[in-house]
């Protein structure tokens, strides 16, 4: 985007440093933590966002520990390694040389090991189930209105192609949004379901990554939709490899 004296910012990612030093004085934005250039006309990858979040000053960071019931993402936040495209590297290691394999949304999918651990490929998360519970309302939301509002949200705010929102289920007060996107379905330029789900999660928690208007304003026929609990489940194209010890 073009730089102006007071308008060189990244509308899709607050966690950037922007300056008018691109070609022709264009505004160029780089993600905090990694210093990688980001495309401010679309969502930034979850890997770069996590890296930026971990690089932010501690007093400016809100650590959110996932619920114990979220069977997959229970390792909390970490400082990930991202590849040159901003995707998670298949193998992640911490400062103490403990390593593990992750899927395309950065969630651990193997037991932890040492530096000899091999992660042959980045396994794609092709199915995401977002489980929400909304605050009490006078009555249940109309299912078709709720469905339309949430589909509209993912299409407009996260630029996710409608075909990737597989279903919206509702049994008051539980809402479930199913996102599905196989490797073969994802074309160049398509937003990744993992990135969309992460932006949605941050929006729901009141930690919007967008500049400008700020927070989410979800309404169904004018009635505010306020979420009081969020759980996100991830299914990979290849099942995870955990030892039986962990399963017990």
């Amino acid at each position: 985007h073009t730089a102006a004296q007071d308008n060189c910012t990244c509308p899709t990612n607050k966690m950037t440093v922007c300056s008018p030093d691109g070609p022709g004085g264009r505004c160029q934005c780089r993600a905090l933590g990694s210093g990688m250039a980001v495309d401010c006309s679309t969502l930034t990858s979850k890997c770069l966002l996590l890296k930026a979040r971990m690089s932010a000053p501690k007093n400016a960071r809100t650590l959110v520990r996932p619920s114990e019931h979220a069977l997959v993402d229970n390792d909390g936040l970490y400082d990930p390694d991202c590849d040159p495209e901003g995707r998670f590297k298949a193998r992640q290691c911490n400062q103490t040389s403990v390593c593990w394999c992750v899927n395309s949304v950065g969630v651990r999918r193997t037991d932890k090991g040492d530096l000899s651990l091999r992660c042959d490929e980045l396994v794609r998360t092709h199915h995401i189930l977002i489980d929400l519970r909304h605050r009490p309302t006078a009555g249940a939301f109309n299912h078709s209105d709720l469905d339309a509002e949430l589909r509209r949200l993912f299409r407009e705010r996260y630029r996710l192609h409608p075909k990737f929102v597989a279903a919206v289920h509702y049994e008051q007060p539980t809402i479930q949004i199913e996102l599905r996107q196989n490797t073969s379905q994802k074309a160049a330029g398509d937003v990744d379901i993992g990135d969309a789900a992460y932006y949605f999660e941050r929006d729901i928690k009141g930690e919007s990554l967008f500049q400008g208007r700020g927070g989410l304003d979800l309404r169904v026929r004018g009635e505010p939709l306020q979420v009081e609990r969020t759980l996100i489940y991830y299914l990979d194209e290849i099942p995870p490899k955990f030892s039986m010890k962990r399963l017990t």
Partner: antibody, heavy 126, light 103 residues
Framework: AVTLDESGGGLQTPGGALSLVCKAS????????MFWVRQAPGKGLEWVGV????????NYAPAVKGRATISRDNGQSTMRLQLNNLRAEDTGTYYC???????????????????WGHGTEVIVSS | ALALTQPSSVSANPGETVKITCSGS???YGWFQQKSPGSAPVTVI????KRPSDIPSRFSGSTSGSTGTLTITGVQADDEAVYFC????????FGAGTTLTVL
């Protein structure tokens, strides 16, 4: 069919105030952001301001900030522009417009306008 | 708000293809037709490439980087008008307008 009807224009005195109303029909008003855009005689289009669908958010162009208030009544499918401390440069045709992307991160923008009213002319002169 | 740059005028013969460009932002472009000063604008393209249902299919929109393009394929005499681009910055902006003359 989507219809947007503006009213309230006319001759206004400098320093005075005007109140324009946009009446919408043919669509679910509650589901859309709404804009005011104006055009001075012989000039281009100028974005005046926007209000989101619930009325909880407004944003204004620097030229009218501090003088303008946009409000809406979803029950009546109407939007209002109140502009105080009128100046000669406020002269022009004022259009009500509909925004097609209420959730977009840049939803304040002109790029999402998909429908326009016929306009109401405002002349600020002593 | 950022300045949007578009040519002041373009001309074409009936049946030819016309392209009008607008540059200045990577946001979403809209294109608005105004047939005479003071007449209401009509949206021919919004959100880069979406066309209102009552607009002929000869109007199309595209974007590349920070440039938006309005294409009129098989221009007609009735398309003669001023075309304004609008874009998606924190407060929406419009270009100065391009006058299309059909020869």
């Amino acid at each position: 069919a989507v219809t947007l009807d503006e009213s309230g224009g006319g001759l206004q005195t400098p320093g005075g105030a005007l109140s324009l109303v946009c009446k919408a029909s043919g669509f679910d008003f509650i589901d859309y952001d709404m804009f005011w855009v104006r055009q001075a005689p012989g000039k281009g289009l100028e974005w005046v301001g926007v209000i989101n669908r619930s009325g909880s958010y407004t944003n204004y162009a620097p030229a009218v900030k501090g003088r303008a208030t946009i409000s809406r009544d979803n029950g009546q499918s109407t939007m209002r522009l109140q502009l105080n401390n009128l100046r000669a440069e406020d002269t022009g045709t004022y259009y009500c417009a509909r925004g097609a992307c209420t959730h977009c991160w840049d939803a304040d923008s002109a790029g999402y306008i998909d429908a326009w009213g016929h306009g109401t002319e405002v002349i600020v002169s002593s | 708000a950022l300045a949007l740059t578009q040519p002041s005028s373009v001309s074409a013969n009936p049946g030819e293809t016309v392209k009008i460009t607008c540059s200045g932002s990577s946001g979403s472009y809209g294109w608005f037709q105004q047939k005479s000063p003071g007449s209401a604008p009509v949206t021919v393209i919004y959100w880069n490439d979406k066309r209102p249902s009552d607009i002929p299919s000869r109007f199309s929109g595209s974007t590349s980087g920070s440039t938006g393009t309005l294409t009129i394929t098989g221009v007609q005499a009735d398309d003669e008008a001023v075309y304004f681009c609008g874009n998606a910055d924190s407060s929406g902006t419009f270009g100065a307008g391009t006058t299309l003359t059909v020869l």
